[in-house]
């Protein structure tokens, strides 16, 4: 699938600019193409690295340009290499001095195994010296000085693959830089044969195409295309699909084209000579002008295309009548396709005449793998090839090429495939809450591995050992209803991205168990302080109809420090628990439930303070109001948390002894007012108020002073003083 072309312009080096251009036509290499010196062919050449640049006129091309440098830097053998599926395709060529003593008849020569071969060099300088011929740098033959002919030849009566190599000729007094080079290519097989055992017949390659001994395909000369190289390109174009163009003012003049072995090098159609700068004489056409026109009806002979057939005629000599051939065209293939990884069935559709057959349609992956159709059908106007990729993966992303190669020509259409990784959640869904018949799930679709966008989500669930069910979900929080109590369930999430086969692999599985239908909480719950560090929780005895063992779970936590939480399991036959190791003067919350294998229902929350470790603070907001002649209303507030058990109101008449006071003890700390009664009218009292807890009494800072009102006049007929 790699169409690699090396243009050597020019192979004979003088003091003019010279170049090598390597083109990967219609092929998008993963690895860059390289141009280098071919030391295998010629050891003693310049060692300097080549200055390889991108050919800006083409997308996939590299170039080396020598601008009138000393010719010793240029003389030698070169290669262009492209790699596909780890295999290298290497094209070789050579450059030599125009002033060499001999010049080769051709830059390369391709022969079949067993051919009778003459490798020839033309003498261009006459010297009184022996002529010597080398193969791959080793001496093979010499001609005494008086016998050096005008055409120096190496004769191989029965060429074998081991005869292949670079042959060079020079006078004995010369050196590498006065040597002429030619490369002999010997096909592994005899003429018209290919295959590992050379027993398969080659397609007849027209127009000097060469049958590849490993594939049986024709390597077409520059200027021809198609399965048999019968189709001529438009003038000045080349490449397997004739898409490349010679940019020179005279087309492909002075371009020597080198193609993969066993083709070797030749001029483009219409040109000949070592420098490809001589036009074909009339009646000749093709690469190196080696083909002759024998047009049946005396049609015009074009040096680029051969016989120009009139309407209704075709064939190399216009000898066939019938419907004219039409170069295949690829139809309805988008430039870009986004594909989900997994099974993929790309389709190639082509028109043309004759209609392409199944064998003539291929699909080339970015790594160079060539796929043959799995299924094929055609209508009157189109051939449709369906290919199967059992498992397409992201590394398969890149430029794929649909290729159609018929006798009527060849066409390739590249298109970009972007293979997406199916999304998969990284985490299992989280079970937020469960009951005996429901579960609240956070499906945790983010983060996920793979490619978005996420089109939809499915939550799969099932009781263990049963089949999966799923629900389509939109939100992250989902409630599953109608579950079975006391059942093990499995959950996982599948993410779906757009496109066919967009369902990702389900993510990790979460297991959970639904609750049993639970018992009610203990009755008669009471929470009371026991000490500064303990509270006592009590409840009524528990009787259940179930035979399952049960226990009371008590959960307590501090209102101040929420983190201080503890769960205590209490055997079911007990009716109290001492919650100890608590902090003094701290309020705790407690709740309880009765659990079997299933968890019971929680009780309401109870709160209590542990006993204080300090004296209580004075009651606050002390007010004495509603004073009459013998009553007064005392009110106050107390601060929570000091285990205040009682409030003491102490009052005495002003001026009386300290011990003549009256104490009123209010044992219910929730009471916040008290009416003093039996006071004397028009009397001043000192009133103190204390809070009392397990440590002692508070210290009042000052006494309140009140004066009762005068007694009301007796209007009931008593004596009146005037």
């Amino acid at each position: 699938a790699m169409d690699l072309i090396l243009i050597n312009s020019l192979p004979l080096v003088s003091d003019a600019e010279t170049s090598l251009t390597c083109i990967a036509s219609g092929w998008h290499p993963h690895e860059p193409i390289t141009i280098g010196r071919d030391f295998e062919a010629l050891m003693n050449q310049h060692q300097d690295p080549l200055e390889v640049t991108q050919d800006v006129t083409r997308e996939w091309a590299k170039k080396v340009v020598w601008k009138r440098e000393k010719a010793s830097k240029i003389n030698g053998a070169y290669f262009c290499e492209g790699r596909v599926r780890g295999q290298a395709i290497r094209i070789r060529t050579m450059k030599m001095r125009q002033q060499a003593s001999f010049l080769p008849a051709t830059l390369t020569m391709t022969v079949d195994r067993g051919d009778n071969v003459n490798i020839s060099f033309k003498k261009v300088l006459i010297k009184e010296e022996d002529a010597v011929i080398y193969k791959n740098g080793s001496f093979i033959h010499s001609v005494p000085r008086h016998e050096v002919p005008d055409i120096l030849e190496v004769h191989l009566p029965h060429a074998q693959p081991q005869d292949a190599g670079v042959y060079s000729a020079r006078y004995i007094g010369g050196n590498l830089f006065t040597s002429a080079f030619t490369r002999l290519i010997v096909r592994r097989c005899e003429a018209q044969k290919w295959g590992p055992d050379c027993n398969r017949p080659c397609t007849t390659c027209k127009n000097n195409g060469v049958c590849h001994e490993d594939t049986g395909e024709c390597i077409c000369p520059p200027g021809f295309m198609g399965r048999t190289c019968e189709k001529a390109c438009e003038p000045h174009t080349f490449g397997r699909t004739c898409k490349e163009r010679c940019s020179g003012s005279e087309g492909c003049k002075s371009y020597v084209f080198c193609l993969p072995d066993p083709y070797g090098c030749s001029c483009a159609t219409g040109w000949r000579g070592l420098q490809c700068n001589e036009a074909c004489p009339y009646g000749h056409y093709g690469p190196d002008c080696k083909l002759r026109c024998h047009c049946t009806n005396e049609e015009m002979c074009d040096r680029f295309q051969g016989c120009l057939c009139s309407q209704g005629w075709q064939g190399l000599q216009c000898e066939k009548e019938g419907r004219p051939r039409m170069t295949p065209q690829i139809e309805d293939l988008p430039d870009h396709i986004e594909v989900n990884s997994g099974k993929f069935n790309p389709i190639c559709k082509a028109s043309g005449w004759p209609l392409p057959t199944s064998e003539e349609m291929t699909l080339v992956k970015p790594d160079g793998t060539v796929l043959q159709p799995n299924d094929f059908n055609h209508t009157d106007h189109f051939s449709v090839a369906i290919f199967t990729v059992n498992r397409i993966l992201p590394p398969d992303s890149g430029v794929w090429v649909c290729s159609v190669n018929t006798v009527a020509g060849m066409v390739e259409k590249p298109f970009n495939i972007s293979v997406k990784v199916l999304p998969e959640p990284l985490h299992a869904p989280n079970v937020i809450d469960t009951g005996h018949n429901f579960a609240i799930i956070n499906i945790s679709s983010e983060p996920y591995f793979g490619d978005g966008p996420i089109k939809s989500k499915k939550l799969f669930y099932k009781p263990v050992n049963q089949a999966w069910k799923y629900i389509q979900v939109m939100n992250e929080i989902v409630t599953l209803n109608y579950l079975e109590p006391r059942t093990d369930y499995e959950l996982c999430v599948q993410l779906v991205r757009p496109g066919e086969g967009g369902e990702g692999h389900p993510g990790p599985v979460r297991r959970f168990t639904t609750a049993s239908i639970g018992l009610p909480p203990p009755r008669g719950l009471s929470l009371l302080p026991k000490s500064q560090t303990a509270l006592n929780l009590t409840w009524q005895p528990i009787f259940t109809s179930s035979e399952d063992e049960f226990y009371v779970e008590v959960e307590r936590w501090s209102q101040q420090t929420r983190s201080d939480q503890q769960n205590i399991k209490v055997p079911g036959n007990l009716t109290s628990v001492l919650l100890n190791n608590l902090l003094p003067r701290e309020q705790y919350s407690v709740r309880a439930r009765v659990n079997t294998k299933a968890q019971g229902e929680w009780s309401e929350e109870l709160r209590a303070w542990t006993l204080s470790d300090i004296l209580p603070p004075q009651p606050e907001n002390i007010k004495i109001t509603n004073i009459t002649d013998y009553t007064a209303l005392v009110s106050w507030t107390i601060v929570d948390g000091y285990s205040i058990s009682s409030i003491i109101i102490r009052y005495k008449v002003q001026g009386k002894n300290e011990d003549q006071h009256i104490d009123v003890k209010i044992k219910n700390a929730t009471i916040t007012q008290y009416q003093l009664k039996g006071l004397e009218p028009e009397t001043t009292y000192h009133v103190d108020i204390f809070a009392e807890n397990n440590i002692g009494s508070s210290n009042p800072a000052f006494s309140q002073e009140i004066r009762t009102l005068p007694a009301p006049k007796d209007l009931g007929g008593g004596k009146m003083l005037l």
Partner: antibody
């Protein structure tokens, strides 16, 4: 006109150093291997060192190995011989010579310079 | 190292004489192909040497045809078929089969 011109010779004390140069003209310098050959007064020729066209291959006579260094600058068309730790027996006329080959094989020296005299004496 | 021995070390000849100089090597100079890795040089007093013959028998460019080289293996000969006045000089053989390249000690051809 094809020619080689040596320079840099002279009188030097034993243990001293000297650098000889050979300027080439009239031919494509970097097409050929180059050599230094010396001749002690009244004696025969002795090959000293050779260097291939691209400096890829360099060889020395045992008598100078480790003391002399041959090099070339193709951009300047010049051959050099750096001579260190000179001894009295290094006294000679030093010729630079062009090979007909590009490598150090099948050598033949078809162009010679006029020579430069190096005298090592205290 | 390959030792090169020339004989005679000197000789006298008259103009027109045929002169033969012999060079013997301590090992064969014949390469795997048919060429011998031996060169002949001529040196005149106060001048640089001049290449006469390379690879045993190939005359260098501009060298008169009266000079010829022959021999193979270890025994080589330089022949001047008819010596001329300008040919009176010292002649050296040099082996190029392996480094170090080594010269013969020279043969001085003088006018009788």
């Amino acid at each position: 006109e094809v020619q080689l011109v040596e320079s840099g010779g002279g009188l030097v004390q034993p243990g001293g150093s000297l650098r000889l140069s050979c300027a080439a003209s009239g031919f494509t310098f970097d097409d050929y291997a180059m050599h230094w050959v010396r001749q002690a007064p009244g004696k025969g020729l002795e090959w000293v060192a050779g260097i291939s066209w691209n400096s890829g291959s360099i060889v020395y006579a045992d008598s100078v190995k480790g003391r002399f260094t041959i090099s070339r600058d193709n951009s300047k068309n010049t051959l050099y011989l750096q001579m260190n730790s000179l001894r009295a027996e290094d006294t000679a006329v030093y010729y630079c010579a062009k090979d007909i080959r590009e490598q150090l094989v099948e050598d033949a020296f078809d162009i010679w310079g006029q020579g430069t005299l190096v005298t090592v004496s205290s | 190292d390959i030792q090169m021995t020339q004989s005679p070390s000197s000789l006298s000849a008259s103009v027109g004489d045929r002169v033969t100089i012999t060079c013997r090597s301590s090992q064969s100079l014949l390469h795997s192909h048919r060429y011998n890795y031996l060169d002949w040089y001529q040196q005149k007093p106060g001048k640089a040497p001049k290449l006469l013959i390379y690879l045993g028998s190939n005359r260098a460019s501009g060298v008169p045809s009266r000079f010829s080289g022959s021999g193979s293996g270890t025994d080589f000969t330089l022949t001047i078929s008819s010596v001329q006045p300008e040919d009176f000089a010292t002649y050296y053989c040099m082996q190029t089969l392996q480094t170090p390249l080594t010269f013969g000690q020279g043969t001085k051809v003088e006018i009788k």
